[in-house]
Amino acid sequence: LYFSRDAYWEKLYVDQPAGTPLLYVHALRDAPEEVPSFRLGQHLYGTYRTRLHENNWICIQEDTGLLYLNRSLDRSSWEKLSGRNRGFPLLTVYLKVFLSPTSLREGECQWPGCARVYFSFFNTSFPACTSLKPRELCFPETRPSFRIRENRPPGTFHQFRLLPVQFLCPNISVAYRLLEGEGLPFRCAPDSLEVSTRWALDREQREKYELVAVCTVHAGAREEVVMVPFPVTVYDEDDSAPTFPAGVDTASAVVEFKRKEDTVVATLRVFDADVVPASGELVRRYTSTLLPGDTWTQQTFRVEHWPNETSVQANGSFVRATVHDYRLVLNRNLSISENRTMQLAVLVNDSDFQGPGAGVLLLHFNVSVLPVSLHLPSSYSLSVSRRARRFAQIGKVCVENCQAFSGINVQYELHSSGANCSTLGVVTSAEDTSGILFVNDTKALRRPKCAELHYMVVATNHQTSRQAQAQLLVTVEGLYVAEEAGCPLSCAVSKRRPECEECGGLGSPTGRCEWRQGDGKGITRNFSTCSPSTKTCPDGHCDVVETQDINICPQDCLRGSIVGGHEPGEPRGIKAGYGTCNCFPEEEKCFCEPEDIQDPLCDELCREQKLISEEDLGGEQKLISEEDLHHHHHH
């Protein structure tokens, strides 16, 4: 048994006479032999669901579900109830109606076994029948909505009449009908005004019925019509077996360059016309089991279940359904030497499905794991400026397909043929398994005899000891020119273009810092700043070379504080800044502020405090003090 609504509404007036019928609650059957029996909860409840009093006023007919006033609710009783409403004004009270027997604890009231009946209280006596508007004679203030379970026996789920009105205003005639298209499964009995289903409903055919209830009021000579929506929602049960869309029960996949744990190897989709079990229960009740194979397969793969609600068209309306994606996922990183082919089977079980037929499907995955060979081009050749500073990035080396690799570990090494000319270093980028070549020793770079640098690049996968080698020829170009005195170690210190471009800094390939002119659009990723190389800094990412020294690119790598309008990077650096951003790595501080401040104005500002506000910047509000501003005159 279940209620056709989770909440009912009616009005209560002071001194309404005992015996007044209030409303019917309705229960629908889950099985033909069920007979409903109703019982009222013990208490009346007020605002925020707090108990007010034992319910001494309202009774229910256990067999019919009729609620009626057992005794009149007088003003003093109402005041007593109001006094218990924890200091809130009392406008509405409610009580609980249970279907017997119920497994619910009385303290909880949850559909389907319990409904709340709300009474709006009016501190006046019942109005004169002639003063009631047609809307008040026809329908409750709160529009009802109904819930009916699919595949259940038909039954009565509503009664249109407003019982207090009928009881206290017997001379007013009110008639009701339902506006509905042909062939709809609802009926309104003209004599009893009871609404019932004609047959069992099928949610997979139609989930919502937006009916209209029409009420015609005859009072003396006048006739008025009132219309209100009458929505019915059909509740789902697990009566559909899972199926394969377009009959696809097999997926084939090749595992080659993507060998990282958690990589999705292949996906198969299962369709289920049902939307139960609900999301909280779904993964527990809709199970997927990777059928036992060899130990290697069991250790290497797992199946992930990703359910999603979708909607499908049925009989001209849309109904909800579920698609279940079953992803075959790598459970561990695969060695590059692995080479095998296998068939995996996954058993999917919709454990709530009762038939007919089976709620079980078998998914098939055909997987080929291919070995990966390490290959480098036969040789690399590139050039480097004699003026390049330490940590300047001058190029990349990469085994064949390295951009596509994930879960494959490749370490790069440089072996120099001339011991005194070992200028470069190499570090492996975590992002794309390439090797970044950078200047490691500037002294060697400046030796005249080191005009050509010869290296052997060795790429190694340590797990398998597989290697690839290539020659690297580096031509050293240009003349070394000593830097002006007083230049900072980090390009990022410079706040203006001229002072930026006249100095070099760590990471600079040309020996000169580069100015990046921003777009001036508030807090932006494209803020103005001074960088060793605008190709790599700032790019919103602290790369493996930049991590070697905070002075290279604090804009990407700083973990300290950022003063002024900005958006912090994740996990470090400046994601976006306002105007120009410059940094002082030793002090672990960066500053972002408007570009158009001229020196005299700035000198003036230094005697005050400057507030960069949220409105100006659209970012964090920061107070810049004299102590912070002295940095702006570093040069």
Partner: antibody
């Protein structure tokens, strides 16, 4: 009718253990939180412990925390109190009581047993 | 933990008297207070909960009031069967705590 009957009390030496039981009847035991409350001779009431209706949560008074364990068997409609490392100050009449919980609010304890006496003495 | 201070600890009264017992909480307990009556050799019996709601079957001469930290139990016309010990209980947060009790004795 609704009834709670405690048992398992007795005389026990300090440091020893005792297990109290509370058999419930006349109501749906698995729908209610259950409490233990004690009263030392000639003294007032002291709340001891509570267990949620489904056994999912429990709370204890500081005086018994770490020594007493509240548990329940809903299939047997029985509440238990495992009392370890007993002290002389645990001597009391132990009541089991039903919690009155409704729509997210606690309303105290509405049904009480008659109690079982625990005496801790060497 | 919330402390409950009950006063007086004892009082002497006659049949027909109006009796008032007070409980003060160490913090706001938002109406979550009950009153219990205990007679010698018997289990406590709930009279009132949620500050002012009368337990079913309890005579209407018992009433409760209060909010925040101050709560009162009133017996409007004391009867002979009302001589007992009365306890307040805060059921707002764990650990629940009782007041130390008020003994109502015959004058």
């Amino acid at each position: 009718q609704v009834q709670l009957v405690e048992s398992g009390g007795g005389v026990v030496q300090p440091g020893r253990s005792l297990r109290l039981s509370c058999a419930a009847s006349g109501f749906s035991f698995s729908s209610y939180g259950m409490h233990w409350v004690r009263q030392a001779p000639g003294k007032g009431l002291e709340w001891v412990a509570v267990m949620w209706y489904d056994g999912s949560n429990e709370y204890y008074a500081d005086s018994v925390k770490g020594r007493f364990i509240i548990s329940r068997d809903n299939s047997k409609s029985t509440l238990y109190l495992e009392m370890n490392s007993l002290r002389a100050e645990d001597t009391a009449l132990y009541y089991c009581a039903r919690e009155d919980w409704d729509e997210g609010y606690y309303y105290g304890m509405d049904v009480w047993g008659q109690g079982t006496t625990v005496t801790v003495s060497s | 933990d919330i402390q409950m201070t009950q006063s007086p600890s004892s009082l002497f009264a006659s049949v027909g008297d109006r009796v008032t017992i007070t409980c003060r909480a160490s913090q706001d307990i938002r109406y979550d207070l009950g009153w219990y009556q205990q007679k010698p050799g018997k289990a406590p019996k709930r009279l009132i909960y949620a500050s002012s709601i009368l337990e079913s079957g309890v005579p209407s001469r018992f009433s409760g009031s209060g909010s925040g930290t101050e709560y009162t139990l009133t017996i409007s016309t004391l009867q002979s069967e009302d001589f007992a010990i009365y306890y307040c209980l805060q059921h707002n947060s764990f650990p629940w705590t009782f007041g130390q009790g008020t003994k109502v004795e015959i004058k």
